[in-house]
């Protein structure tokens, strides 16, 4: 069961896995949640009654019964991991800790104007886990305004001490705020021979890459496939690092694959969620339970529902045995990965889906699209919303995209003449406008946030956020789309679609069924040639066919230009403006969302 509240002056007895240092009980709970085995924790706050060497200790604990005896202890704060909860979880920690020095390896020291600048430096440095900044009131003159970037093997401090006039905090890489590049390629027949920080077993290079991404010290990896000549090293995933942050040694070797941590774009890819099944593959590990199950899918469900289960192997039933039920082996290990992977024994293996909630909802696979045709089907574009105005009469005003459970991203120009958010209604999960009746449920708008540099669509900054009055419960027909990563600026998107209920030609009417059109992106240089009278800035992105014929049009404004990349849909553009609709050599112009990620996060993550 999910217990979120913290238990003051309470200590859990026994079950210790390991001790780390965290600046707060709240962060200790996050560390416990992300640890492969931790179910409970006890944190020791600073207190005159406690030995200072025990301040800020976070003891991670496990228990077969999922609970432990409670003991009263002043300054102890205990609680449960969020593994047992169904809500979305994030490792993002923007808190700044005053008068705390978080100890680690100080590998970089420089002058910074503020703690915020120091935190940004940490976020954009590949090695940095956390920082300590000496403020201008720091007693030692030569250390004032010094920003120390730090790292450790675990990503958490090795100790935390009280120190006046310093502040400390964590890298914001896990908040999607890093400008570091995101190298998504996996290099076949390549070994990176740099330092290994850890090794785990993985069924394929993709899982190896995801493990690297959420391992605090891993910058790149090498994976030995099941065809690797050395049997003892098959399925071995080597997690690696180097001083420069890049591999210094690339060696050609067949049956090996190498790649990079996707830390700086992890909010738009699944990192914890290994949803595939591995056929004719057995995962070895500590056995938790053996239960009968009808299929490998049922076995995965059983593993997901058992909080301590990390992975499983299903052995299908021998004909007519046990009512057609096979055996489902629920397993765990110290690091969440199989201790060995065997092939050719007929098992079907996979991982718990319990950790999927640690990934952004937007990375969830949606139903396969219908190829061809222009009318969409239900659930094809679950982030698309229709924004209605009720004044003077109710009508479709603009499109928009769900980007969070209380947030819609749309175009600023949609709100020309809109005096109050009270007249707006957001409908999600809609395919046909005719579905919208008086009693159809909608989301009221609490606030319209228009970019403060917006003047008119053609001059850019055509972007706005709607904060909803209530939260969206995600389902197959309404769920968010991922924002592009800042580290993905150089990605060339080839599978882009514009959707909306807008006109199908310049003089037309709003369409009943949500329309879709696949449209190629056009370079900004090419786009500028087509719009000599306008300035096409890097904050705009263009899409269209040279010959015209397919485009967004009136009523599509604010809606998404959605591009699929590595199986995940990204909101690359917001429909903004164009000369006419679908005219020859007149591409549509869209707000280039990647250039506004900081603005979006600043507005949506504001406390």
């Amino acid at each position: 069961e999910c217990v979120t509240q913290l238990l003051k002056d309470t200590c859990f007895e026994g079950g210790d896995i390991t001790t780390v240092f965290t600046p707060s009980a709240k962060y200790c709970q996050v560390v416990c949640t992300y640890h492969p085995r931790c179910l409970l924790f006890t944190f020791t706050a600073e207190s005159p009654s406690e030995d200072p060497t025990r301040w800020f200790t976070c003891v991670l604990k496990d228990s077969v019964t999922e609970t432990l005896p409670r003991v009263n202890r002043t300054a102890a704060i205990s609680g449960y991991s969020f593994k047992q909860c169904s809500h979305q979880i994030s490792a993002c920690n923007k808190d700044i800790y005053v008068d705390l020095d978080m100890k680690g390896i100080n590998y970089n020291s420089s002058v910074a104007k503020s703690a915020q600048e120091c935190q940004e430096r940490c976020t954009d440095d590949v090695h940095c886990h956390f920082f300590t900044y000496a403020t201008r009131q720091f007693p030692s003159l030569e250390h004032r305004n010094i920003c120390l970037l730090k790292h450790t093997q675990t990503g958490t401090p090795t100790r935390i001490t009280k120190l006046d006039k310093v502040v400390s905090g964590f890298s914001l890489k896990s908040c999607a705020l890093s400008n570091l590049a995101c190298i998504r390629d996996i290099f076949p027949n390549t070994v990176f021979a740099d330092s290994n920080i850890d090794s785990v077993m993985a069924p394929d290079a993709f899982v190896c890459g995801r493990i690297c991404t959420h391992h605090p010290g891993c910058l790149f990896f090498t994976f030995f496939s099941q065809e690797w000549p050395k049997e003892s090293q098959r399925n071995l995933c080597l997690l690696k690092t180097s001083e420069s942050g890049l591999p210094s040694t690339r060696i050609k070797k067949s049956k090996a694959l190498s790649g990079f941590s996707l830390q700086s774009c992890r909010h738009s890819i699944p990192v914890f969620c290994h949803s595939s099944f591995y056929h004719d593959t057995d995962f070895l590990g500590e056995e938790l339970d053996i239960v009968a199950a009808k299929s490998h899918e049922a076995c995965q469900k059983l593993c997901t529902n058992a909080v301590r289960c990390q992975f499983f192997t299903y052995t299908p039933a021998q004909a007519s045995c046990n009512e057609g039920k096979g055996k489902c082996y629920l397993k765990l290990s110290s690091n969440g990965s199989p201790t060995k992977i065997l092939h050719g024994r007929g098992g079907i293996s996979g991982y718990t889906l319990r950790l999927c909630k640690m990934d952004n909802e937007c990375t969830t696979k949606i139903k396969p699209r219908i190829v061809g045709g222009t009318a969409s089907v239900r659930g094809e574009w679950p982030w698309q919303v229709t924004l209605h105005t009720t004044s003077p009469t109710q009508r479709h005003l603009c499109g928009g995209s769900i980007i969070g459970n209380q947030w819609i991203l749309t175009a600023a120009h949609c709100f020309y003449g809109v005096e109050s958010p009270k007249i707006l209604r957001v409908y999600s999960g809609i395919l046909n406008q005719s579905e919208i009746k008086e009693d159809t449920s909608f989301f009221g708008v609490q606030e319209i946030i228009i970019h403060d540099q917006y003047k008119m669509a053609e001059s850019g900054y055509d972007i706005a956020l709607l904060k909803l009055e209530t939260t969206v419960n995600y389902t197959d027909s309404q769920r968010p789309i991922c924002l592009p990563s800042k580290g993905d600026r150089n990605v060339i998107y080839t599978d882009c679609w514009v959707t909306g209920w807008g006109y199908r030609k310049l003089r037309d009417k709003i369409q009943n069924t949500l329309q879709k059109a696949k449209i190629p992106l056009v370079t900004n240089e090419e786009c500028q040639k087509r719009y000599r009278g306008h300035k096409i800035t890097h904050k705009m992105i263009c899409a269209g066919y040279r010959e015209g014929g397919k485009d967004a049009c009136k009523g599509d404004s604010g809606g998404p230009l959605s591009c699929k990349h590595n199986e995940v849909w990204h909101l690359v553009g917001i429909t903004s403006w164009g000369e006419g609709c679908a005219q020859r050599e007149r591409p549509g112009v869209y707000t280039n969302v990647v250039e506004y990620v900081d603005w979006i996060l600043e507005k949506t993550q504001a406390v």
Partner: nanobody
């Protein structure tokens, strides 16, 4: 039990040469990717050169053109011919089998299926 035994280390003047050997036993040498690593006092373990089972070679930039790696599968032996030695080549040299990168900067800890020798000291004086 797998054994890798290095020999040929010693003291030499800058500009001189040495040839290191590594004799392997208890595993199929010709199927293994072999390497030389080195660790200078206070420094991390660094890869010097690799020779794969099919004969492909790799050299660290700092030794390119001066060191040559080779293997004799019939003798289960790996070699490192070191010419034009410099004082900065001073280190303990380790022979390794199927070891792609050191672990935590140390030339002794391995992952499954990877093996290290005990090391041989090379001292280059100016």
């Amino acid at each position: 039990q797998v054994q890798l035994v290095e020999s040929g280390g010693g003291s030499v003047q800058a500009g001189g040469s040495l040839r290191l050997s590594c004799t392997a036993s208890e595993f199929t040498f010709d199927d293994s990717d072999m390497a030389w690593y080195r660790q200078a006092p206070g420094n991390e373990c660094e890869l010097v050169s690799t020779i794969t089972s099919d004969g492909g070679t790799y050299y660290a930039d700092s030794v390119k053109g001066r060191f040559t790696i080779s293997r004799d599968n019939s003798k289960n032996t790996l070699y490192l011919q070191m010419n034009s030695l410099k004082p900065e080549d001073t280190a303990v040299y380790y022979c390794a089998a199927d070891q792609w990168g050191s672990a935590e900067g140390d030339c002794t800890s391995s992952y499954p299926g990877g093996y290290w020798g005990q090391g041989t000291l090379v001292t280059v004086s100016s």
